[in-house]
Interface confidence: low
């Protein structure tokens, strides 16, 4: 691929590219892409591989340029890079490109999988780990158990999965999980299929998600006491302001991280 001539990295090191409020947002959110150069620059360019490019220019005599994407649509998602240049570099000469920033604009995140490690059948006295695996890193994961209104556990994970440990004696039951962006504006995933954990000798069974009537879906945070959590089968009701789950009354048998947990 032919690109504008790029000098050695030591001459014009790459800038940093970040997104506010987040790199994963719902459609309609205003997103600001910030390109920060390690030295004052004259022109910044925002690039999207293969697009009619540069996508946007900013002429600013400073280290920072902001590119405003108003009321983003899914089509504006994708990979972005930025470069900077100075007038004394000569025509067509740009800095090294920034690392890739991937902007995801979506109503909901892909459904995670929920699996038991080492398996869904628990022996006497053995603990079991449930792994909720999505596709994105740096997400907050939430585990539910059928018949328990409040979420059982929260985990913030740098990996695209989180492991939840269940004590063997209390492990059997029906579970589901989901994940969401760790900060506002929150984007929630679809919830996983349910997973049945059973005692040795009983045999596990898989059930479609809609047949878990006792489980509760993510509801509004405690700051909205008048609102009711929707049922699990209507996981993403239209019109509800989507918020991630915040710790509420915890089930006594399997405590969740306290509210100070950074993943909450």
């Amino acid at each position: 691929d032919i690109t504008p001539s790029v000098p050695p990295a030591s001459y014009h090191p790459k800038p940093w590219l970040g997104a506010q409020p987040a790199t994963v947002v719902t459609p309609g959110v205003n997103v600001t892409l910030r390109c920060r150069a390690p030295q004052p620059a004259w022109r910044f360019g925002l690039f999207k591989p293969g697009e009619i490019a540069p996508l946007l220019f900013r002429d600013v005599s400073s280290e920072l340029a902001e590119f405003f994407l108003e009321e983003v649509t899914p089509a504006q998602g994708g990979i972005y890079r930025c470069c900077y240049r100075r007038p004394d570099w000569g025509p067509g000469v740009w800095s090294q490109p920034s690392d890739v920033l991937e902007l995801l604009v979506t109503e909901e995140l892909p459904r995670p999988s929920l699996v038991a490690l080492p398996g869904p059948v628990v022996g006497p006295g053995a603990n079991v780990s449930l792994r909720c695996a999505g596709r994105l890193r740096n997400m907050s994961f939430v585990l539910y158990r059928e018949g328990v209104a409040a979420p059982l556990q929260y985990r913030h994970s740098a990996q695209p999965w989180a492991d939840f440990t269940l004590l063997g004696a209390r492990a059997p039951g029906t579970y589901s999980c989901y994940y969401h962006t760790p900060s506002a504006p929150y984007v929630l995933s679809q919830r996983s299929e349910v997973l049945v954990i059973s005692w040795e000798g009983e045999g596990p069974e898989a059930r479609p998600a809609s047949s878990a009537p006792g489980m509760q879906a993510p509801g509004p945070p405690p700051s909205d006491p008048g609102a009711q959590a929707p049922s699990l089968s209507s996981f993403r009701p239209r019109g509800l302001v989507l918020q991630p789950l915040l710790p509420q009354t915890q089930d006594s048998w399997d405590p969740a991280p306290p509210p100070s947990d950074p993943g909450v």
Epitope: D1, T3, P49, G50, I52, A53, A75, Q76, P91
Partner: antibody
Framework: EVQLLESGGGLVQPGGSLRLSCAAS????????WTWVRQAPGKGLEWVSG???????NYAQNFQGRFTISRDNSKNTLYLQMNSLRAEDTAVYYC????????????WGQGTLVTVSS | QSVLTQPPSASGTPGQRVTISCSGS????????VSWYQQLPGTAPKLLIY???NRPSGVPNRFSGSKSGTSASLAISGLRSEDEADYYC?????????FGGGTKLTVL
């Protein structure tokens, strides 16, 4: 080696349809903006349509509604579906790949001739 | 009628310097890159200049591009017989790619 190979051209009657293909090899097809450019006999280059990596395809005004560009990243292939063809659509049709940051077409196919005549 | 305007023809003798102009507006050339293509008879266009003044590898430094305001130009120095071809400028606006009408260069 980087290569683009167009096919699907030929003789078609006015009002007819034709589908052109452009098979790419030698680089990651899905990473780039792809485009069709045409050249009528003895005339200059005319941009027809483009297929971005993300988002909706774009078209020159003359072709909106009659022509449809599409891509199959799994097959490394770009397509141009041409409907309601007219005599003035007679041209060599080239597919081309856009460069990363320069707003230019760095790789071109050899072209395929479309003749619209009764 | 092309949005980018080029002279239909240009000529020069071997060794001479020839310049081809391309005129546009603030919505295309004024705010965006200009590229130049060479099309030899019976062949596909070939990228000659991109980003106003950059040469792809393999293009001789006899070819140079420049841009000023809403106009651009392609200069060919040390003209050779193999430079006889059609030359097209190209830029873009917010939604389309634009080509000049082309300039037929004759080496006398």
């Amino acid at each position: 080696e980087v290569q683009l190979l167009e096919s699907g051209g030929g003789l078609v009657q006015p009002g007819g349809s034709l589908r052109l293909s452009c098979a790419a090899s030698g680089f990651t097809f899905s990473d780039y903006y792809w485009t069709w450019v045409r050249q009528a006999p003895g005339k200059g280059l005319e941009w027809v349509s483009g297929s971005p990596v993300f988002g909706a395809a774009n078209y020159a005004q003359n072709f909106q509604g009659r022509f449809t560009i599409s891509r199959d990243n799994s097959k490394n292939t770009l397509y141009l579906q041409m409907n309601s063809l007219r005599a003035e659509d007679t041209a060599v049709y080239y597919c081309a790949k856009a460069g990363f940051t320069g707003g230019h077409f760095d790789i071109w196919g050899q072209g395929t001739l479309v003749t619209v005549s009764s | 009628q092309s949005v980018l305007t080029q002279p239909p023809s240009a000529s020069g003798t071997p060794g001479q310097r020839v310049t081809i102009s391309c005129s546009g507006s603030s919505s295309n050339i004024g705010n965006n890159y200009v590229s130049w293509y060479q099309q030899l008879p019976g062949t596909a266009p070939k990228l000659l200049i991109y980003g106003n003044s950059n040469r792809p590898s393999g293009v001789p430094n006899r070819f140079s591009g420049s841009k000023s305001g809403t106009s651009a130009s392609l200069a060919i120095s040390g003209l050779r017989s193999e430079d006889e071809a059609d030359y097209y400028c190209q830029s873009y606006d917010s939604s389309s790619w634009l080509f000049g009408g082309g300039t037929k260069l004759t080496v006398l």
